[in-house]
């Protein structure tokens, strides 16, 4: 039997400078594309190698992005969220939620779609 899986949730402000190829990550989520059950939030699904986010090093796959330049990402359609990032300017401030898995007992399995990465 697997041990209990707990999560440590932390928030962080990440300031990125848009690089030659942009911010360098992919997102999933939105009111029309729920990636996590009962949660229409926006999550990072991919960090592009050598992109701005990868070079900064703080943004991780599985992170939930709460706001962009102070604008809340709640209740947005997926494409509206994408467009918000694309139009966010050169200096982009992200409020993100990291969800770190903490194991108690035997290691469990984290499946695809689990926001912890």
């Amino acid at each position: 039997m697997n041990g209990r899986v707990d999560y440590l949730v932390t928030e962080e402000e990440i300031n990125l400078t848009r690089g030659p190829s942009g911010l360098g990550f992919n997102i999933v989520g939105g009111t029309d594309q729920q990636y996590v059950s009962n949660d229409s939030g926006i999550y990072v699904s991919r960090i592009k190698e050598n992109g701005a986010a990868a070079l900064d090093g703080r943004l991780q796959e599985g992170d939930k992005i709460l706001s962009v330049n102070g604008q809340d990402l709640k209740n947005l359609l997926h494409q509206d969220a994408v467009d918000l990032f694309r139009n966010a300017g050169y200096a982009v401030s992200l409020r993100v939620q990291h969800r770190l898995q903490v194991q108690n007992g035997p290691i469990g399995h984290r499946g695809e779609g689990d926001p912890s990465g």
Partner: nanobody, 125 residues
Framework: EVQLVESGGGLVQAGGSLRLSCTAS????????MAWFRQAPGKEREFVAA??????YYADSVKGRFTISRDNAKNTVYLQMNSLKPEDTAVYYC?????????????????????WGQGTQVTVS
């Protein structure tokens, strides 16, 4: 890890049709951006078509002849190929990435995608 399995290739006469299928693993298939590339012997890999959350994209060489579509309930993306020409002969590869890029999307750039299938041979005689 996303697994992609292509099927539907074969030998067809010029002017004929084929429908390629690509079935993907994973329970969040609807969030995947999917594409088809092809590679003919001695030639570079070439973009064919892509389907993202926001729409579909085609290479000029196949526009009006090929149609990309998806069935999220079946975790499958399709490439309907009509009016096939001998120059369409190639190995066709399915590719995918989870989510949508927040940057300008370049569907024909192989670096946009993380996962690749093994390919299916299409021969037009």
């Amino acid at each position: 890890e996303v697994q992609l399995v292509e099927s539907g290739g074969g030998l067809v006469q010029a002017g004929g049709s084929l429908r390629l299928s690509c079935t993907a693993s994973g329970r969040t298939f609807s969030t995947y951006t999917m594409a088809w590339f092809r590679q003919a012997p001695g030639k570079e890999r070439e973009f064919v078509a892509a389907i993202s959350w926001s729409g579909t994209y085609y290479a000029d060489s196949v526009k009006g002849r090929f149609t990309i579509s998806r069935d999220n309930a079946k975790n499958t993306v399709y490439l309907q190929m009509n009016s096939l020409k001998p120059e369409d002969t190639a190995v066709y590869y399915c590719t995918a990435v989870i989510g949508s890029t927040v940057d300008s999307y370049s569907p024909s750039d192989p670096l946009e995608y993380d996962y690749w299938g093994q390919g299916t041979q299409v021969t037009v005689s």
